[in-house]
């Protein structure tokens, strides 16, 4: 039975009966706000395999394990997400696991799992099996690994039942619970799914299946479901509907949902069933269901009731879909996201006409604006205090406004104002100003050549290396003295370098989301003598590494508003010279008799340099204590042991607490304050977490019914 | 998928009330679609009584209105008609029905609710 | 309320023949926004009415084509172009155009 369009249970535990006959729920599925405690254990719902939207979970009391309720949770499609998320759960206070043992695949969209203060197996779960991407899955605040002792099926008693993976550089044991592994299916399967038999299912199976190489037994569908069978498209007078089933042209007719009370009903378009035409298209006369492509744009005014459209996940701009015409403002503020600028393409790329201004501030998320790709006029109507309809702040990576080869912008009434954007080269803004018409409104302040472009690559000319010698911490380099036409216009050289292990990097890589650059940079003035060429000594370096090395002359920006040519060398990539290696890793021994040892031991960390040989020593040494002081048969007393790695382990830490200043050489240091930038990315994280918190919130606490 | 299935006493006395629940599964009647009464008088044709939208709001057929009532209760999924001073005449076998945009997809099975002392 | 007259109230049909069904309101049941909302139901014996046409002509998906239906503004049409046993029943017209919805008062169909 399919259920849908949604199905959202609150205050009340009984309400899950509702998912009683549910083989496949159309839409989300909720379940939230329920404060008292319940036991959950005669709530089973085996027959749910798919979900076809996202699955939230919202400070539920008493739910322990979803693996209970939902034993045979296939599939999280994904098709519709709650902000850029298909599983969430937050504030489950007494989860302890997971346990969605027969969840495989998550077809879009990531997870957030937060402040479950009792939640364990987390680490236990590979969740790159099930989701495409695991970048932007969001695991925060939970009960703390090693308070959680996870261990998988089999493992006290030394006979593993789970199957290994790595994640993060750690090979382990893979599980949901104690008793439960995480499936994974034979690598002769590829990326089909596979039976509880490890049998390949057929390839238009997802998920699993009941029997093998058969399309009527899957639990679900790759493509879409129709008639019993899993097809890779719809058949003839069949449409695709809700991204996963086929539905006749009667069904699509009859449609009438709470989520497009449009009076004009539903169309079929290109195969499919949807709320309204697709971007491009307008509807064969104000009844039909058939699209017909518009003559240029189609027109579709968007308009926000609270004037300010804030555009910070990929759901806030799926509300601005089709739009041609949007009447306000709009505040863009994208901090993180997979696949952004398509995303927000998708949806905001027809917008040709803004009545009022556009705000885009930390939107660290973002190299260019291209997604906008069909803005032409800010009529800025309204305006921001200072008269500015055209409003850019502290975008960390934004390299390129538009493309104004091929791009017409007008900017009709207002300002520009531009600050605190590194990567963003002046001349940009500048070429902005000429197009959209600006140029004379701005002030002098409005458009900040100190901090716009500070860190981005905005020269024209090339500098040339002379000079490289090495040692094994040092390089030292020189390079042509740059002579601008005015010597004057010269201030100094910036040499930025790094760890390069492959000659790929580019100047703009290692800079997250949130902005870190991954690039050293080291000041180096001009030689006061003429026939000196300039120089530097990089010390402190890795033995035998490669590194990455490119010099900028640092100039005057701007001489009464000529612009400058700057220089930038390409990038140079040279390696250290070899050294002594790093102690080996991992150093295991076993005893397989009274009178041998067995001794495995991984590489050094920095073998620095070609390792050929290793030394072995051994000596006697008296029984260890510590052996006798746990009880190893109790699964929450396994005292967690790290071979060790060079770091202190935090438990020895605060077993002896340090109070050496920092710096002092008697011990370990207390932890260094943090830097700005490390203060910086805590608060952004803060609040990036307060917009999700907020997002949540505006969402699930609705007026109570009639 | 969508299964409708009407509930009540199957005898009413007359001047009483008649009290019938529409239990919805596979489909959330807060989600889409009008949530219909239907009756038939036994060898009779159908009488349309009223429909509740999935908003909450109401539309009856006239001549009934000042008799009949349909409410719903979303945690139960369900939908009720009340139909207040009966007589012989709402002896009749009431139907539920899902109405979408354009035309009925889903009925209930009927019950029979007999008007009599 | 829309009155719909349906005619004639009862059809004997031979298996093989067509057979015509007519439905008339006493005004116009075109919507505002242009679509007539005009079905065509039936109820077979001990069963729940099911859907044969909606909008006037639309054979909904699985009815057999030897159903048809026509018609505009008044006056409608129900065509059965060779009667089956197994078309046996009451059909109903349906207007869902005006705010207050109506049915016909039904055509029974049997075999000769």
């Known amino acids: 039975e399919i259920c849908g369009p949604g199905i959202d249970i609150r205050n009340d535990y009984q309400q899950l009966k509702r998912l009683e006959n549910c083989t496949v729920i159309e839409g989300y599925l909720h379940i939230l706000l329920i404060s008292k405690a319940e036991d959950y254990r005669s709530y089973r719902f085996p027959k749910l395999t798919v979900i076809t939207e996202y699955l939230l979970l919202f400070r539920v009391a008493g739910l322990e394990s979803l693996g209970d309720l939902f034993p045979n949770l296939t599939v999280i499609r994904g098709w519709k997400l709650f902000y850029n998320y298909a599983l969430v759960i937050f504030e489950m206070t007494n989860l302890k696991d997971i346990g969605l043992y027969n969840l495989r695949n998550i077809t879009r969209g990531a997870i957030r799992i937060e402040k479950n203060a009792d939640l364990c197996y987390l680490s236990t779960v590979d969740w790159s099996l099930i989701l495409d991407a695991v970048s932007n899955n969001y695991i925060v605040g939970n009960k703390p690994p090693k308070e959680c002792g996870d261990l998988c099926p089999g493992t006290m008693e030394e006979k593993p039942m789970c199957e290994k993976t790595t994640i993060n550089n750690e090979y382990n044991y893979r599980c949901w619970t104690t008793n439960r592994c995480q499936k994974m299916c034979p690598s002769t399967c590829g990326k089909r799914a596979c039976t509880e038999n490890n049998e390949c299912c057929h390839p238009e199976c997802l998920g699993s299946c009941s029997a093998p190489d058969n399309d009527t037994a899957c639990v679900a569908c790759r493509h879409y479901y129709y008639a019993g069978v899993c097809v890779p498209a719809c058949p003839p007078n069949t449409y695709r509907f809700e991204g996963w089933r086929c539905v006749d042209r009667d069904f699509c007719a009859n449609i009438l949902s709470a989520e497009s009370s449009d009076s004009e009903g539903f169309v079929i378009h290109d195969g499919e069933c949807m709320q309204e035409c697709p971007s491009g298209f307008i509807r064969n006369g104000s009844q039909s269901m058939y699209c017909i492509p518009c003559e240029g744009p189609c027109p579709k005014v968007c308009e926000e009731e609270k004037k300010t459209k804030t555009i910070d996940s990929v759901t806030s701009a799926q509300m601005l879909q089709g739009c041609t015409i949007f009447k306000g403002n709009l505040l863009i503020n994208i901090r993180r996201g997979n696949n952004i600028a398509s995303e927000l393409e998708n949806f905001m790329g027809l917008i040709e006409v803004v009545t009022g201004y556009v705000k885009i501030r930390h939107s660290h998320a973002l190299v260019s604006l291209s997604f906008l790709k069909n803005l032409r006029l800010i009529l800025g109507e309204e305006q921001l205090e200072g008269n500015y309809s055209f409003y850019v702040l502290d975008n960390q990576n934004l390299q390129q406004l538009w493309d104004w080869d091929h791009r017409n912008l007008t900017i009709k009434a207002g300002k520009m104002y531009f600050a605190f954007n590194p990567k963003l080269c002046v001349s940009e803004i500048y070429r902005m100003e000429e197009v959209t018409g600006t140029k004379g409104r701005q002030s002098k302040g409005d458009i900040n050549t100190r901090n716009n472009g500070e860190r981005a690559s905005c020269e024209s000319d090339v500098l040339h290396f002379t000079s490289t010698t090495t040692s094994k911490n040092r390089i030292i380099i020189t390079w042509h003295r740059y002579r601008p036409p005015d010597y004057r216009d010269l201030i100094s050289f910036t040499v930025y370098y790094k760890e390069a292990p492959f000659k790929n990097v580019t100047e703009y890589d290692g800079q997250d989301a949130c902005g870190s650059n991954s690039w050293n940079m080291v000041d180096v003035d001009l030689p006061p003598n003429k026939d000196v060429e300039p120089g530097i000594l990089l010390h402190g370096l890795k033995p035998w590494t490669q590194y990455a090395v490119y010099v900028k002359a640092v100039t005057l920006t701007m001489v009464e508003n000529d612009h400058i040519r700057g220089a930038k060398s390409e990038i140079l990539y040279i390696r250290t010279n070899a050294s002594v290696p790093s102690i080996p890793l991992d150093v295991l021994s076993a005893s397989n008799s009274s009178s041998q040892l067995i001794v495995k031991w991984n590489p050094p960390s920095l073998p620095n340099g070609n390792l050929s040989y290793y030394i072995v020593r051994w000596q006697r040494q008296p029984q260890d204590g510590y052996l006798y002081r746990h009880n190893y048969c109790s699964k929450d007393k396994i005292p967690i042991r790290k071979y060790a790695d060079g770091t202190i382990d935090i438990e020895e830490v605060t077993e002896n607490p340090k109070t050496e200043v920092c710096g002092g050489e008697k011990g370990p240091c207390c932890a260094c304050p943090k830097t700005e930038a490390e203060k910086q990315a805590e608060k952004e994280e803060a609040e990036y977490r307060k917009v999700f918190e907020n997002f949540l919130h505006n969402s699930i606490f609705v007026p109570r019914p009639e | 998928q969508v299964q409708l299935q009407e509930s009540g006493p199957g005898l009413v006395k007359p001047s009483e009330t008649l009290s019938l629940t529409c239990t919805v599964s596979?489909?959330?009647?807060?989600?889409?679609?009008?949530w219909n009464w239907i009756r038939q008088p036994p060898g009779k044709g159908l009488e349309w009584i009223g429909y509740?939208?999935?908003?909450?709001?109401?539309n009856y057929k006239p001549s009934l209105k000042d008799r009949v009532t349909i409410s719903r209760d979303t945690s139960k999924n369900q939908f009720s008609l009340k139909l207040s001073s009966v007589t012989a005449a709402d002896t009749a076998v009431y139907y539920c029905?899902?109405?979408?945009?354009?035309?009925?997809?889903?009925w209930g099975q009927g019950t029979l609710v007999t008007v009599s002392s | 309320d829309i009155v719909m007259t349906q005619s004639p109230l009862s059809l004997p049909v031979t298996p093989g023949e067509p057979a015509s069904i007519s439905c008339r309101s006493h005004?116009?049941?075109?919507?505002?926004?242009?679509?007539?909302?005009l079905q065509w139901y039936l109820q077979k014996p001990g069963q729940s009415p099911q859907l044969l046409i909606y909008k006037v002509s639309n054979r909904l998906y699985g009815v057999p084509d030897r159903f048809s239906g026509s018609g505009s503004g008044t006056d409608f049409t129900l065509k059965i172009s060779r009667v089956e046993a197994e078309d046996v029943g009451v059909y109903y017209c349906?207007?869902?155009?005006?705010?207050?919805?109506?049915f016909g008062q039904g055509t029974k169909v049997e075999i000769k």
């Open positions: 349906f207007q869902g155009s005006h705010v207050h919805w109506t």
């Open positions: 005004q116009s049941i075109v919507h505002s926004n242009g679509n007539t909302y």
């Open positions: 596979g489909y959330s009647i807060t989600g889409g679609y009008l």
């Open positions: 029905a899902r109405h979408g945009r354009v035309f009925f997809d889903y």
């Open positions: 509740i939208h999935y908003d909450g709001t109401n």
